[in-house]
C-alpha cells in the first residue's frame, strides 16, 4: 500500500479510565498531513464522532474510558503530499487496584509510571497527563499508599509534586488524580507510579545553568502585561527542580488568591548533550508593588532573579 | 524475575580493549541504575560505573580515562568497554542492578560473572 | 573519595559464637549497604539501608550505624554463614566498597 510502517509502540494501560495517544513523528506531522486511525488493520476508520467512546480527536485517538476489549494494535497513518508513513501502537489494557497490597508493582509499566527520588535532595514526581486540547483536567491530587498526601514537605505544582529533602521513607507506591472533563462528561484519571530512591547524584555533580535572566533588571510600563521566560540548560539525566518564587516562596502560592503573577507550564527541547528547559512567569498586570522585587529563577542550586523598574521618563 | 547475563571474551591482550555485554531479561534498561563491578583475584570488590535510565553514564574517577558504558535498548543490553588494559585489569566482571524494595543503590540482581584474563 | 576499612580483614570464628564486622568510613556516609559473597559466586545484597536485611537474609544477621561507623553482626554463627563480606556506600562518588572481611571457620 505505500506506506512505510515506522515502529511498534506498546503501551500498557488501566482499565475504565481515559487514555490519549498522539500520533507525532516530527519531522514527517509537522507539515502539511493528514493523520488518520485504524484498529487491528481494520479498513475502517476510528470514528471522528465526539460522542463515540473511541473517537480521533485531531491526531489523537481517545479512548473515553478505556476498556478490556479496547487491548490491541492501532495504525494512526499519515499521509502527506508524497508520503505516507505509518504508525503501530500496541495497547494493552489491564486491571489494577492501586490499593491492592497483594500486587506487588507492575513489571511493564511505561517508564513514565516509575520515577526516582534523590535521597537528601528536594527532587519531585511527575504525573503525566498526555490528552487532547478537548480535555479539560482539574487539580491533581497526590497518594501514597492510598492516603492522600498532606504536610510540609510536599508541593503541588502544575502537575508536579514536589517533595524537599527526599527520605527513604518515600519510597513505595504513588498515584496522581485527575478528573477529566470531557463534552460535558467528568472522568476520573488515576496514574499509579512506583517510586523507588537513590543517593546517587542524578546529574553526575554538574549544576544548572540559568542562561535569562542574569539579575538584570526589566523596563515595563504601569498596569502591562508581562511575560519573561527563564531558560534553563541542564543534563539529561537531572532531577532538578525548576520554578519562579518571590520572597522565597512559589508565586503560584504567593500570589494565590489574587492569581495575578502565575508560572507557566515547563517545556524542553532535547539536545545531544544536555536539555533546554524554558518555565515563565507571567504578570497579568504590573503593579507598583512589583517593581524593585526580585523574581527569583530557581533550578537546582542555581538561582537567578529580574527586577522590574519603571521606564525612564521621555523628555523628548 | 530480573535476570542478567555478561557475555565476552575471557581472554584479552595487552594494550587491548576489554568488551563485555550485559543482557538483561524481566526488566526493561530504561528504567533504574545499570552496573559493572569487577573482583579482582583475591581481592576485593571495584565499582566500575553505571548508566541510568536515562543513558547518562557514571564512571569510578580511576578508571574513568579508559571506561566507556553504552546501552542497545532495542536489545535490552548495556555494555562496557574497557582500553590499554593491563594483567591488573584481570578480575571477574559482573553486571548488576537494583531496585530492590524500592531502592536503587540495593544490588539484588547479579549476572553470574565473566573471568576475563589479561595475557599475551 | 571516601576510604571504607572493614576489620577485621579476616576472622576465624566457630559455630554458634556471635560475630560483628565493623565498617569505617573515612567521611559521614547515609547509609551501608552489606554483600555477602562465596568462592565462584557473585555476590548476594544483604543489607540495605543500613538495617534492612534483604529476602531470604536469616535474623540473626542484623545492621545498625550511623555517621562513619557502620557494624554487621550476626548473633550466633551457622556453617553456611562462612563467607566474604563487603560494605559499600553510594553517599559520595565514588561508590566505594571496603576490602572484604573473610569470614572463616574455626
Known amino acids: 500500500d505505500g506506506c512505510n510502517d515506522i515502529f511498534m509502540k506498546n503501551e500498557m494501560l488501566s482499565a475504565s479510565q481515559p487514555f490519549a495517544f498522539n500520533c507525532t513523528f516530527p519531522p514527517i506531522t509537522s507539515g502539511e498531513v493528514s493523520v488518520t486511525w485504524y484498529k487491528n488493520s481494520s479498513k475502517i476508520p476510528v470514528s471522528k464522532i465526539i460522542q463515540s467512546r473511541i473517537h480521533q480527536d485531531e491526531t489523537w485517538i481517545l479512548f473515553l474510558p478505556m476498556e478490556w476489549g479496547d487491548s490491541g494494535v492501532y495504525q494512526c497513518v499519515i499521509k502527506g503530499r508524497d508520503s505516507c508513513h505509518r504508525i503501530h501502537v500496541n495497547l494493552t489494557v489491564f486491571e489494577k487496584q492501586w490499593c491492592d497490597t497483594s500486587v506487588k508493582g507492575l513489571p511493564n509499566l511505561s517508564d513514565e509510571y516509575k520515577q526516582i527520588l534523590h535521597l537528601g535532595k528536594d527532587d519531585s514526581l511527575t504525573c503525566h497527563l498526555h490528552f487532547p486540547k478537548s480535555c479539560i483536567l482539574g487539580p491533581i491530587k497526590w497518594y501514597k499508599d492510598c492516603n492522600e498526601i498532606t504536610g510540609e514537605r510536599f508541593t503541588v505544582l502544575e502537575t508536579r509534586l514536589l517533595v524537599s529533602n527526599v527520605s527513604a521513607e518515600d519510597r513505595g507506591n504513588y498515584a496522581c488524580q485527575v478528573i477529566l472533563t470531557h463534552s460535558g462528561k467528568q472522568y476520573e484519571v488515576l496514574n499509579g507510579i512506583t517510586v523507588s530512591i537513590t543517593e546517587r547524584a542524578g546529574y553526575g555533580g554538574s549544576v544548572p545553568k540559568i542562561i535569562y535572566p542574569k539579575n538584570n533588571s526589566i523596563e515595563v510600563q504601569l498596569g502591562t502585561t508581562l511575560i519573561v521566560d527563564c531558560n534553563i540548560t541542564d543534563t539529561k539525566d537531572n532531577t532538578n527542580l525548576r520554578c519562579w518564587r518571590v520572597n522565597n516562596t512559589l508565586v503560584d502560592d504567593y500570589y494565590n488568591e489574587s492569581k495575578r503573577i502565575r508560572e507557566g507550564v515547563e517545556t524542553h527541547a532535547s539536545f545531544r548533550e544536555y536539555n533546554l528547559y524554558t518555565v515563565n512567569i507571567t504578570f497579568l498586570e504590573v503593579k507598583m508593588e512589583d517593581y524593585g522585587l526580585p523574581f527569583m529563577c530557581h533550578a537546582g542550586v542555581s538561582a537567578a532573579y529580574i527586577m522590574l523598574q519603571l521606564p525612564a521618563p521621555d523628555f523628548r | 524475575q530480573v535476570q542478567l547475563q555478561e557475555s565476552g571474551p575471557g581472554l584479552v591482550k595487552p594494550s587491548q580493549t576489554l568488551s563485555l555485554t550485559c543482557t538483561v531479561s524481566g526488566a526493561s534498561i530504561t528504567s533504574g541504575y545499570w552496573n559493572w563491578i569487577r573482583n579482582h583475584p583475591g581481592k576485593g570488590l571495584e565499582y566500575i560505573?553505571?548508566?541510568?535510565?536515562?543513558?547518562?553514564?557514571y564512571y569510578n574517577p580511576s578508571l574513568k580515562s579508559r571506561v566507556t558504558i553504552s546501552r542497545d535498548t532495542s536489545k535490552n543490553q548495556f555494555s562496557l568497554k574497557l582500553s590499554s588494559v593491563t594483567a591488573a585489569d584481570t578480575a571477574v566482571y559482573y553486571c548488576?542492578?537494583?531496585?530492590?524494595?524500592?531502592?536503587?543503590?540495593?544490588?539484588?540482581?547479579w549476572g553470574q560473572g565473566t573471568l576475563v584474563t589479561v595475557s599475551s | 573519595d571516601i576510604q571504607m576499612t572493614q576489620s577485621p580483614s579476616s576472622l576465624s570464628a566457630s559455630v554458634g559464637d556471635r560475630v560483628t564486622i565493623t565498617c569505617r568510613a573515612s567521611s559521614n556516609v547515609r547509609y551501608m549497604y552489606w554483600y555477602q559473597q562465596k568462592p565462584g559466586k557473585a555476590p548476594k545484597l544483604w543489607i540495605y539501608?543500613?538495617?534492612n536485611l534483604a529476602s531470604g537474609v536469616p535474623s540473626r544477621f542484623s545492621g545498625s550505624g550511623s555517621g562513619t561507623s557502620y557494624t554487621l553482626t550476626i548473633s550466633s554463627l551457622q556453617p553456611e554463614d562462612f563467607a566474604t563480606y563487603y560494605c559499600?556506600?553510594?553517599?559520595?562518588?565514588?561508590?566505594?566498597f571496603g576490602q572484604g572481611t573473610k569470614l572463616e571457620i574455626k
Open positions: 560505573g553505571y548508566i541510568s535510565y536515562s543513558g547518562y553514564t
Open positions: 548488576a542492578t537494583g531496585g530492590y524494595d524500592y531502592v536503587e543503590d540495593a544490588l539484588y540482581y
Open positions: 559499600q556506600q553510594y553517599t559520595t562518588s565514588p561508590y566505594t
Open positions: 539501608l543500613t538495617s
